[in-house]
Interface confidence: low
């Protein structure tokens, strides 16, 4: 199910307490630039600056709280946005050096 | 797009060995976990750890290969499986395989390499 | 670390015929979906099949069907064939958000013999 949209990056004093409040913080980030070019979410070229913050965002905060990176709540969020974002995506980036090549409908792109 | 395991070979008792992982047609620099795992001959399949290619990636153990097995990310296409204090029961079958994400399963293997701990 | 229990170990079926694998997590995997089918032939790596419990992988025949949630997983195999015959794993992800629990595991294998 599609992650809340709601709420504050930190807690009092707008800190971040926990790993979870600050991947909800990426996680509305990310809505906030995704959400106005909805039309373009298929387009590489419109969404991997938003897509490569989510990653950045998401790894930031993993080392801040000793974390590894990714860890399973991070790669819920990554999981999420293929569901949400990419789900109808049919076009595939042709190199695996780039986040983006896993952008596609089926999530799914290894080669034996 | 693959994955090629190295360094198997025949090792006495109590002796090291370490294998390497090898990526050919692309890197695991992004995205990329890299996993080992290993079969005893005639039996299933079991995992010993995994790391992540990028920069602040770090490796997680099955509890029972901490301590005695060390993974580590060389370079954007190699990573490599340091094995410690070995015994007949590491002899088994080697395999190093890949996933971009830990849910997606692991897609991409190599053929294997074999470790015989014998004296 | 969790365990994976596969039944059953060994199952013979006529080609045509359906075959059904199950495999139970002694805890519910990561995200409740972290489960993943393999077919191994002997002599080579396994081959994935099922990814997040049902997602089927590329060039993977639509006979191949992965169900379940949470601790119970199933691989169903239908109009079996004996290019089927071969050994099958599960293999889940354990996690706990947030933290740096990461941990897999597989199940014990079950071998196809298609008669």
């Known amino acids: 199910q599609p992650l809340p949209t709601t709420g504050t990056p930190g807690s009092e004093g707008g800190t971040v307490k926990n790993y979870e409040t600050a991947v909800q913080f990426c996680w509305n980030h990310y809505k906030d630039q995704m959400d106005p070019i909805e039309k373009d979410w298929c387009d590489w070229a419109m969404i991997s600056r938003p897509y490569s913050t989510l990653r950045d965002c998401l790894e930031h905060f993993a080392e801040l709280f000793d974390l590894g990176f990714p860890n399973p709540l991070a790669e819920r969020i990554i999981f999420e946005t293929h569901q949400i974002h990419f789900a109808n995506c049919s076009l595939v980036q042709p190199t695996f050096s780039d986040p983006p090549e896993d952008v596609r409908g089926s999530h799914h792109h290894h080669h034996h | 797009q693959s994955v090629e395991e190295s360094g198997g070979d025949l090792v006495k008792p109590e002796g090291s060995l370490t294998l390497t992982c090898t990526a050919s047609?692309?890197?695991?620099?992004?995205?990329?976990?890299i996993c080992w795992v290993r079969q005893t001959p005639g039996k299933g399949l079991e995992w010993i750890g995994c790391?992540?290619?990028?920069?602040?990636?770090?490796p997680y153990y099955a509890s029972w290969a901490k301590g005695r097995f060390t993974i580590s990310k060389t370079s954007s296409t190699t990573v490599t499986l340091q094995m410690t204090s070995l015994t007949a029961a590491d002899t088994a079958a080697y395999f190093c395989?890949?996933?971009?994400?830990?849910?997606?399963?692991?897609?991409?293997w190599g053929p294997g390499t074999l470790v015989t701990v014998s004296s | 670390d969790g365990v994976m229990t596969q039944t059953p170990s060994s199952v013979s079926a006529a080609v045509g015929s359906t075959v059904t694998i199950s495999c139970q997590a002694s805890?519910?995997?990561?995200?409740?979906?972290?489960l993943s089918w393999y077919q191994q032939k002997p002599g080579q790596p396994p081959k994935l099949l099922i990814y997040?419990?049902?997602s089927l992988a590329s060039g993977v025949p639509s006979r191949f069907k992965g169900s379940g949630s949470g601790t119970q997983f199933t691989l169903t195999i239908s109009d079996l064939e004996c290019a089927d015959a071969a050994t099958y794993y599960c293999?889940?992800?354990?996690?706990?958000?947030?933290?740096?629990?990461?941990?897999?595991?597989f199940g014990g294998g079950t071998e196809v013999v298609v008669k």
């Open positions: 293999q889940c992800t354990y996690g706990k958000s947030g933290t740096d629990t990461y941990l897999n595991a």
């Open positions: 790391i992540y290619g990028g920069s602040s990636g770090r």
């Open positions: 047609g692309f890197s695991f620099s992004i995205s990329y976990w």
């Open positions: 997040t419990a049902s």
């Open positions: 805890q519910s995997v990561f995200s409740n979906n972290y």
């Open positions: 395989a890949t996933t971009a994400y830990g849910g997606y399963g692991y897609g991409t």
